[in-house]
């Protein structure tokens, strides 16, 4: 018969014959022959191959470098790479998550509307009238002004978006 010019899925063409690809998690040791099947070997510890392949070397698992703020989100297997994510309070600088930066803090006068995730930064919002934030924080929302009336006190100093109201005693009526 004529030698094949194309092979089926999960096969590759070599020396005019179709050989089986190695399955994910295994690397190629030797091509098939007329008499022998393709020889494959499992990837070693901390190695992987994630496709049907004819690679002679497995890929190294990604290293999640703690000096770059990274930690392991999902441990790699022989078929999958390690997935890194950022330490609490940090987020990735790129889609590949090769390093991390601190989440944006909301300045005094602003509160956190949405806490940051691994792929998006903190969303800040200006504190509306009746609310304040006196700290720079990536977690704190705007706080409501103290209600002096509920404490039988009066407002001695108005609040701002950065400061709480100051309450004081009511003036006693003179007899």
């Amino acid at each position: 018969p004529e030698p094949p010019t194309a092979c089926r899925e999960k096969q590759y063409l070599i020396n005019s014959q179709c050989c089986s690809l190695c399955q994910p998690g295994q690397k190629l040791v030797s091509d098939c022959t007329e008499f022998t099947e393709t020889e494959c070997l499992p990837c070693g510890e901390s190695e992987f191959l994630d496709t049907w392949n004819r690679e002679t070397h497995c890929h190294q698992h990604k290293y999640c470098d703690p000096n770059l703020g990274l930690r392991v989100q999902q441990k790699g297997t022989s078929e999958t790479d390690t997935i890194c994510t950022c330490e609490e309070g940090w987020h990735c600088t790129s889609e590949a998550c090769e390093s991390c930066v601190l989440h944006r803090s909301c300045s005094p006068g602003f509160g956190v509307k949405q806490i940051a995730t691994g792929v998006s930064d903190t969303i800040c919002e200006p504190c509306p009238v009746g609310f304040f934030s006196n700290v720079s924080s990536a977690f704190e929302k705007c706080h409501p002004w103290t209600s002096c009336e509920t404490k039988d006190l009066v407002v001695q100093q108005a609040g701002t978006n950065k400061t709480d109201v100051v309450c004081g005693p009511q003036d006693r009526l003179r007899a």
Epitope: T93, S94, E95, V101, S107, T117, V119, S120, D121, E125
Partner: antibody, heavy 121, light 107 residues
Framework: QVQLVESGGGVVQPGRSLRLSCAAS????????MHWVRQAPGKGLEWVAL????????YYADSVKGRFTISRDNSKNTLYLQMNSLRAEDTAVYYC??????????????WGQGTLVTVSS | DIQMTQSPSSVSASVGDRVTITCRAS??????LAWYQQKPGKAPKLLIY???SLQSGVPSRFSGSGSGTDFTLTISSLQPEDFGNYYC?????????FGQGTKVEIK
């Protein structure tokens, strides 16, 4: 290369509804927050709505809150804007916008060509 | 909401001129500012982000500076293709807001 293609614009009467779509390609759609930004004829830019990368949170400009709904289908790489109770002041070109993401979140790095919505009786 | 005010509203300059556009925020926005260019009938294009970082593919004649409330976009040597509208945008806090725009015309 990144491509954002909007569709669904047109002429609609006040009080009626319209749904805009945006087909995204050339980037990992499911990793990025997306926005809608609009521009009334001869006017400036106005941010309209945001949806997070996984659709878990959504934010709206006060001018459209309660009337517009942003959504996404990551399996189809598509962003949507459902616009109900349309008003004359919603007349604008609507742009589908990719968030720059990660350490550059809330900057808008790629924009679609825009789709015109005209609200008129 | 944070108001963004641009000046001038329009500028007419010759090829080779240095053009400066300013943007003022109503509150401190640190360095969370972007500049966009929009040509007639086209979508805006990101030029500068984080106040001074040049977006990939943007010519180096564009530069940004400033922090806090006052920001500047500079075109060091105006080219014929630089005409259009320029907008600043604050990315410090929700809701994200734009300046009203500056129209750049070539003399």
């Amino acid at each position: 290369q990144v491509q954002l293609v909007e569709s669904g614009g047109g002429v609609v009467q006040p009080g009626r509804s319209l749904r805009l779509s945006c087909a995204a390609s050339g980037f990992t759609f499911s990793n990025y927050a997306m926005h809608w930004v609009r521009q009334a004829p001869g006017k400036g830019l106005e941010w309209v709505a945001l949806i997070s990368f996984d659709g878990s949170y959504k934010y709206y400009a006060d001018s459209v809150k309660g009337r517009f709904t942003i959504s996404r289908d990551n399996s189809k790489n598509t962003l949507y804007l459902q616009m109900n109770s349309l008003r004359a002041e919603d007349t604008a070109v609507y742009y589908c916008v990719k968030d720059a993401g990660y350490s550059s979140s809330w900057f808008f790095d790629y924009w679609g060509q825009g789709t015109l919505v005209t609200v008129s009786s | 909401d944070i108001q963004m005010t641009q000046s001038p509203s329009s500028v007419s300059a010759s090829v080779g001129d240095r053009v400066t556009i300013t943007c003022r925020a109503s509150q401190d926005i640190s360095s969370w500012l972007a500049w966009y260019q929009q040509k007639p009938g086209k979508a805006p294009k990101l030029l500068i982000y984080a106040a001074s970082s040049l977006q990939s593919g943007v010519p180096s004649r564009f530069s940004g500076s400033g922090s806090g409330t006052d920001f500047t976009l500079t075109i060091s040597s105006l080219q014929p293709e630089d005409f259009g509208n320029y907008y600043c945008q604050q990315a410090n806090s929700f809701p994200w807001t734009f300046g009203q725009g500056t129209k750049v015309e070539i003399k």
